[in-house]
Each structure stands twice: as C-alpha cells, then as structure tokens.
C-alpha cells in the first residue's frame, strides 16, 4: 500500500483550511478521549480511479468521497482519519486530514475527497473514514467503512494499467488445445515480443472429480526475434488412465518484467460425451 | 443514456419462485459490477445482492443467503436474480442498480445514494 504523488497531496477547500498528514493510523484522541466528539461521516462513496505518476505510469487509485451530517457536531470536528486496510496482507496504510480553522455551516453541505491510495488489481480493502476526535469508549461510533474490492487485470481497463501491463496483460495467447490419437494433446499458443522462456502446466481429472489424476510440467525454450508473435505448437503425452480425462493446460509465462510472478493462461479440455449405452438386446428370444 | 428495465415481478405463492431480470443499455455492460436492491411497502431501502463484473464474486444479504442467486449474461446485457423458498418478508419493489465505478463493494453498493436504477418490478408474495 502507497500513496501516488505525495507531494500534491491537498485537502482545503473555500472556508475550510486544511493540511493532509502522514498518520499512524493511531490518533492521539484514542489514548486521550475528548468528551465532545463530532457525528459520523455521511454518504461514503469508494469509486475506482485511474490517476498518472509524474513519471507517465498508470495506477488504479481509491477514491474516497463523503459528507458532513448537518449537525452542531461539526464544531467539535477536528478532521478525519482516512484508512485503507489490504484484507489478505492485513496492511494498513492511513493518513490524516487536520483542520486548521473551525468549520461552520454554510449553505451547501461540507464534501470531502482523496485520490490518493494506490490499490492493486484483484485485492480487496476496508476503507474507513474516521472524524476525529474518535468517540469516547463507550461512546456512538463516528467512523463509516465499505469493503471494497479492485478488478482484476482481465477488466479491459485495468489491462491497461502499469501495474496489469508489467505481469503480462497485453500478452493474449489464444490457446486452443486438441485432443489426438494415442492418448495425445496439442497445444498452441501465440508467443508474445520477448526472448523469454515459457511453461506448459498440465494438469488432468476425473469427469466430475476436482483431485487430479495426472501432471505435467513442460518447458519451452526462449524463441528467437524472429518467432515472436508466431504459434508455438507442442504435442504432450498424456497418462493412458481411463476416466481421467479433463485436461487443464496452463501457460506460465517468464518476462523479464514480472519473472515468475506473471499472469498465467489456461485452457481446459471436457471429457467426450459418453453416448448412453442402451440395455443390449438379445440375437435371439427364447420361446419358453 | 443509461437505463435499466427491471421485469420478473408477479404475485407468488409462499416457498414457490420466480426470477427476475434486468435488461441494460447506454452503458458498457460489463465493465461494471451490479446489484439488486428491494424496497418493501412503506420501509426504507435493502440491498439484496450483488456480482461483479465477470461474476467472480457474488454476495447476499443474510434475509436472503441460500435462497436467491444472482447471475449475468455480459452477452446479453442482463442481470438476473433467481428467487427460491419465497417468503412473506420478500414482498417489495425490487430494483437492479449500477455501480458508479469500475470497483465492487460487498454487502453494499460503493455509492449511495445509489447511482443508476431502473423503475424496478414488485413481487408479492401472498397465500
């Protein structure tokens, strides 16, 4: 988890001034409770941004909206805790919007935004807008979360973004997989722009069965300039098991941008359709 | 512009189903994670379901987990909603809703108010 741009970070507005801070996402107000602490946000909205670095790379950004209640809590509001927990890392990362002058009404609704938290493809986040001071102990909690998951790098938009383009995005392999005589498969793949080598994963199954009765492993060596963009065909050996006849391939690609950690393909083979054998009839009926 | 045509609605008899659908236009389709969303008479407003994108991820809302299923067709430009073991407490104006953003929120729309949502199709659910 990080913050894009750091430097340009702003949270004033007109009659609001206001500076974005680092935080550890452990407010002062939480060891030293105020007695008078402002209501919850309102209306908390999490929308998917795309934003540039400086540098011209395209990143996936959270972008965090809420409101003021119009209430005279606002007169005890200090400014909010903005935090993006990473559910599967347990990462946090927070900073802190700090009021430097009082709120006061005005004739449309206090918002607030942040565009600011990089989120990765195919994670998922709690984003919590804290008002601070945080609420006594016991206290009614002025905090509102959204759990929050990011499309993956198949999305048509994410694909595009830097952090989808270095595992391989733009590489579209095309597999299609044939069955052939003698307990064959043939694989064919469309090689991307690079000298790098690539792995065919196969893995087979049972008809309806999820634990797998056969694996392969399968290297393809670094094609030349001249390969690229071209169909690599490779015919694999498959384990004479009857019954064990869905075929999973995987392509694991090896590029220099995301080595052994680039999105991977996959194509699957259904077991034939086994024709209902009818009951067989007897060549002849007996008369008794 | 975008518009959502919820259909499926009627009167039903308790544990019988129904399914619902959704029929969108205006918009690319399946960029876009949706929800399903209810009202019953003179309450505020539920959310019931929702999927993603691709359909990678679906979630409910406890009132309704084991008996409604959520699907789409990114083909078709539709959303779905197949109701099951239909209950009294099921009786509402039930809506499909998309998201603002490319992002999806479980248990719950990222923005609310929620952002596009059609005219909805009432299910009754009476003896």
């Known amino acids: 988890l990080r913050l894009l741009d750091h430097r340009a970070l702003v949270c004033s507005q007109p009659g609001l001034n206001c500076t974005v801070k680092n935080s550890t996402c452990l407010d002062d107000s939480w060891i030293h409770p105020r007695n008078l602490t402002p209501s919850s946000p309102k209306d908390l909205q999490i929308q998917l941004h795309f934003a540039h670095t400086q540098q011209g790379d395209l990143f996936p950004v959270a972008h965090i909206e809420w409101t003021l209640q119009t209430d005279a809590s606002i007169l005890y509001l200090e400014g909010a805790e903005l935090s993006v927990l990473q559910l599967n890392t347990n990462e946090r990362l927070c900073v802190r919007f700090e009021f430097l002058s009082k709120l006061r009404h005005h004739h449309r609704r206090w918002r607030f935004t942040f565009s600011h938290f990089v989120v990765d493809p195919d994670q998922e986040y709690e984003v919590t807008v804290h008002h601070l001071p945080k609420p006594i102990p016991d206290g009614d909690p002025n905090h509102q979360s959204k759990n929050f998951l990011v499309p993956d790098c198949e999305h048509a938009r994410m694909k595009v973004t830097t952090p989808c383009m270095s595992s391989g995005s733009l590489w579209d392999p095309n597999i299609t997989v044939e069955t052939l005589e003698a307990h064959q498969l043939r694989v064919s793949f469309t090689l991307w722009n690079e000298s790098t080598h690539y792995q065919i994963l196969l893995t087979s199954f049972p008809h309806m069965e999820n634990h797998s009765c056969f694996e392969h492993m399968h290297h393809i060596p670094a094609p030349r300039p001249e390969e690229f963009h071209q169909r690599s065909n490779v015919t694999l050996t498959l384990r004479n098991l009857k019954g064990c006849c869905r075929h999973q391939v995987q392509i694991q690609p090896f590029f220099s941008s995301c080595l052994n950690d680039c999105l991977r393909h996959s194509a699957t083979v259904s077991c034939p359709e086994m024709p209902d054998t009818p009951e067989p009839i007897p060549d002849y009926m007996p008369l008794w | 512009q975008v518009q959502l045509v919820e259909s499926g609605g009627g009167l039903v008899q308790p544990g019988r189903s129904l399914r619902l659908s959704c029929a969108a236009s205006g918009f690319s389709f399946d960029d876009y994670a949706m929800h399903w969303v209810r009202q019953a008479p003179g309450k505020g407003l539920e959310w019931v379901s929702g999927?993603?994108?691709?359909?990678?991820?679906?979630d409910y809302a406890d009132s309704v987990k084991g008996r409604f299923t959520i699907s789409r067709d990114n083909a078709k430009n539709s959303l779905y909603l197949q109701m099951n073991s239909l209950r009294s407490e099921d009786t509402a104006l039930y809506y499909c809703v998309k998201e603002r953003s490319l992002g999806y929120c479980r248990g719950g729309t990222c923005s609310e108010p929620f952002h596009i949502w059609g005219q909805g199709t009432m299910v009754t659910v009476s003896s």
């Open positions: 999927i993603t994108w691709n359909s990678g991820r679906k």
